[in-house]
């Protein structure tokens, strides 16, 4: 039995913390979808649709499920082992530098620019200068003409909210 698993096979980060007085390193953690009881003896299930845990843990409580905000759609519900996956509604996007809210995508590019990327749940439309091909970022000046386009359809889920 060359690949026999023993206590020694556990990587240091997989072993229970030394300050936890438990009988064996393998018994100090609870599996995904659970948290540990206060006395450290039992594993207690997270509540389906209410909270979750994604990794082996010694948490005293599971993590609260994310509730999708208005302006977001729920791509997949919260289970005991996975948080809710929320995505910005069509026509809106979430930027890395402002992940707390979905922002409206621009409806078109400024004059002298051409659209090369659609609105997605994780990015605004992408505009480049017709001649130079350099990207333009920032708001569309109110006085300039814009080339309008309809928002693109989502291709894949964006990051979790919350």
């Amino acid at each position: 039995e060359s690949a026999l698993i023993t206590q020694q096979d556990l990587a240091p980060q997989q072993r229970a913390a030394p300050q936890q007085k438990r009988s064996s390193p393998s018994e100090g953690l609870c599996p995904p979808g659970h948290h540990i009881s206060e006395d450290g003896r039992d594993c207690i299930s997270c509540k389906y649709g209410q909270d979750y845990s994604t990794h082996w843990n010694d948490l005293l409580f599971c993590l609260r499920c994310t509730r999708c905000d208005s302006g977001e759609v729920e791509l997949s519900p919260c289970t005991t082992t996975r948080n809710t996956v929320c995505q910005c509604e069509e026509g809106t996007f979430r930027e890395e530098d402002s992940p707390e809210m979905c922002r409206k995508c621009r409806t078109g590019c400024p004059r002298g620019m051409v659209k090369v990327g659609d609105c997605t749940p994780w990015s605004d439309i992408e505009c480049v200068h017709k001649e130079s091909g350099t990207k333009h970022s920032g708001e569309v000046p109110a006085v300039e003409e814009t080339v309008t386009s309809s928002p693109g359809t989502p291709a894949s889920p964006c990051s979790l909210s919350g």
Epitope: I5, T6, Q7, D9, L10, A11, Q14, S24, S26, E27, L29, P31, P32, G33, H34, S37, D42, C43, I44, S45, K47, Y48, W56, T79, T80, T81
Partner: antibody, heavy 119, light 107 residues
Framework: KVQLQQSGTELVKPGASVKLSCKAS????????IHWVKQRSGQGLEWIGW????????KYNEKFKDKATMTADKSSSTVYMELSRLTSEDSAVYFC????????????WGQGTLVTVSA | DIVMTQSHKFMSTSVGDRVSITCKAS??????VAWYQQKPGQSPKLLIY???TRHTGVPDRFTGSGSGTDYTLTISSVQAEDLALYYC?????????FGGGTKLEIK
Amino acid sequence: KVQLQQSGTELVKPGASVKLSCKASGYTFTEYIIHWVKQRSGQGLEWIGWFYPGSGYIKYNEKFKDKATMTADKSSSTVYMELSRLTSEDSAVYFCTRHEEDGYYAAYWGQGTLVTVSA
Amino acid sequence: DIVMTQSHKFMSTSVGDRVSITCKASQDVSSAVAWYQQKPGQSPKLLIYWASTRHTGVPDRFTGSGSGTDYTLTISSVQAEDLALYYCQQHYSTPYTFGGGTKLEIK
């Protein structure tokens, strides 16, 4: 298709030990916990504990802590449970089971191994 | 440990009848209840989990309900092949525990 194939019937003497096996197939062996369940003749079901092949994490029901020892062999996708110091109370059918991702209910069951302890 | 009590060890019914098998937990198990069917000489088979979710391939005449401490497995129209032992199990807290079983007999 998920399958759990258990070893055959065992007739053992009191005081001896026996090692049962549960060979898993049809899924990634290291991603799911294997549980063991005891059923005495004409009686209910008792959860013995779990073994997680991914890292060797074990959880025993306190009642079976001094009775059962779980190990695994990743190369053959097999989990083992050794029962020691056998008495007539250990005569039972032992099942290995596998849960699904979102809860520790037994979605898949082995066919069971009958252990008879008799002099 | 959480005790799961199935008050009826036996239940007698006729083909086509509606039957309800009950299970009571000694404490709130937050709907983390599964139901199994076991026929003689076979391994148990999962019917219901999370109190009311039907497992793949289970006929829709089997339904689960309940919350807190009280749970029920209902067979809406009993068939001859439903003659079996039925167990509830809490998958809320270790050690996971099973009810004593209810044997469904056909009149």
